[in-house]
């Protein structure tokens, strides 16, 4: 598949809006409900909300000889999460990433927290159409990983995963291991 | 025009098996999902699973897994269900409803749906 | 299994009056919710689906609305051609599981 768009979303947003109907507003919404934060420790004496980076992805499918009818909207889920007062210098990684690094014994990973089947239809050159289920993230979350190494370590493969801060019961919906395996 | 003709009414002895078909038309057979649809007094309407005619993969709820067995002949654009080991808790009437999509994204709703098919149990 | 609860199982309205069906799910199901209309000789139509967005071919008399867990269907000019029996379904966790119907009569 190749990616049309990408945008950095925080997520701050704690229940999305549906889209109104409408003819043209198409693409699924997140059928999890909206992204989240965490509310968790710098340390023992400093109580902060820590934001996941997200990024909002349109892509459109292909099987190779069939490409998807419409872009499908996913999440992607990136980086480090950080306190909110600071992700506004996370991207230039100043500040932030000093701060966070010095404060805390614990890296804060933005990883997939919920995902669902999809199914989406793909036109063919021959006129036909096909369609397959995908699975695509809609929701991320603020993992924790405790380092293994020396605290400026920013070298993921080292961490080991700790106990996350909220739990957040997955949907029942069968899903796929790989992201975009399609039956 | 799409249309979803499905077989005529069944009466069938317990223990039997019988296979149910839902002709299609009016649209391209591949490109969408196919579900079942069973029908009784008590218990309303329940989903019994769906398949997907481009790869002949099915998903069942697993109430019916041991009952229902969902198949397509593309060349036909039909949709099979088979049920087996009839007993009178089968006796219902079976719907064939196609997925619903808009702009090529599935909402979850069955958009059209079939006449149904009428199977009684009996001895 | 995500439970589809329609409290109502009949109802009766005259001609012309605003009727709403309600529909609620034992779990939040993110809007993914449609709305059937099953007339007395066994015909199925889609009505409503993701909630809130009119299938093609119904009737903008026909609407829906709701969030989390509570749904519901409104008709707002009841005609003739409306008496059947209306069902909720859900489709945001499979299996589908769909509500025990309002049976709508006239008055």
């Known amino acids: 598949f190749k990616n049309d768009a990408t945008e950095i979303l925080y997520s701050h947003v704690v229940k999305p809006v549906p889209a109104h109907p409408s003819s043209n507003s198409t693409l699924n919404q997140a059928r999890n409900g909206g992204r989240h934060f965490s509310n968790t420790g710098l340390d023992r004496n400093t109580r902060v909300q820590v934001g996941c980076r997200e990024l909002r992805s349109t892509k459109y499918i292909s099987d190779g000889q069939c490409t998807s009818i419409s872009p499908l909207k996913e999440l992607v889920c990136a980086g480090e999460c950080l306190p909110l007062p600071v992700l506004p210098n996370w991207i230039g990684g100043g500040y932030g990433t000093k701060y966070w690094s010095r404060r805390s014994s614990q890296e804060w990973r933005c990883v997939n927290d919920k995902t669902r089947t999809q199914r989406i239809q793909l036109q063919c050159q021959d006129g036909s159409t096909r369609t397959y289920k995908i699975t695509v993230v809609t929701a991320c979350k603020c993992k924790r990983y405790t380092r293994q190494h020396n605290e400026s370590s920013h070298n993921f493969e080292s961490m080991s995963p700790a106990k996350p801060v909220q739990h957040h019961r997955e949907r029942k919906r069968a899903s796929k291991s790989s992201k975009h395996s399609m039956s | 025009e799409v249309q979803l003709q499905q077989s005529g009414p069944e009466l069938v002895k317990p223990g039997a098996s019988v296979k149910i078909s839902c002709k299609t038309s009016?649209?391209?057979?591949?490109?969408?999902?196919m579900s079942w649809v069973k029908q009784s007094p008590e218990k309303s309407l329940e989903w019994i699973g769906e398949?997907?005619?481009?790869?002949?993969?099915?998903t069942y709820n697993q109430k019916f897994k041991a009952k229902a067995t969902l198949t397509v002949d593309k060349s036909s654009s039909t949709a099979y269900m088979q049920l087996k080991s009839l007993t009178s808790e089968d006796s219902a009437v079976y719907y064939c409803?196609?997925?619903?999509?808009?702009?090529?994204?599935?909402?979850?709703?069955?958009?059209?749906w079939g006449q149904g098919t009428s199977v009684t149990v009996s001895s | 299994d995500i439970q589809m609860t329609q409290t109502t199982s009949s109802l009766s309205a005259s001609l012309g009056d605003r009727v709403t069906i309600s529909c609620r799910a034992s779990?939040?199901?993110?809007?993914?919710l449609s709305w059937y209309q099953q007339k007395p000789d066994g015909t199925v139509k889609l009505l409503i689906y993701?909630?809130?967005r009119l299938h093609s071919g119904v009737p903008s008399r026909f609407s829906g609305s709701g969030s989390g867990t509570d749904y519901s269907l409104t008709i707002s000019n009841l005609e003739q051609e409306d008496i059947a029996t209306y069902f909720c379904?859900?489709?945001?966790?499979?299996?589908?599981?769909f509500g025990g119907g309002t049976k709508l009569e006239i008055k």
């Open positions: 409803a196609r997925e619903g999509y808009y702009s090529g994204i599935s909402y979850d709703a069955m958009d059209y």
């Open positions: 009016g649209y391209s057979f591949t490109g969408y999902y």
């Open positions: 398949i997907n005619p481009t790869t002949g993969g099915s």
């Open positions: 779990q939040d199901i993110s809007n993914y």
């Open positions: 993701y909630t809130s």
């Open positions: 379904q859900q489709g945001n966790t499979l299996p589908r599981t």
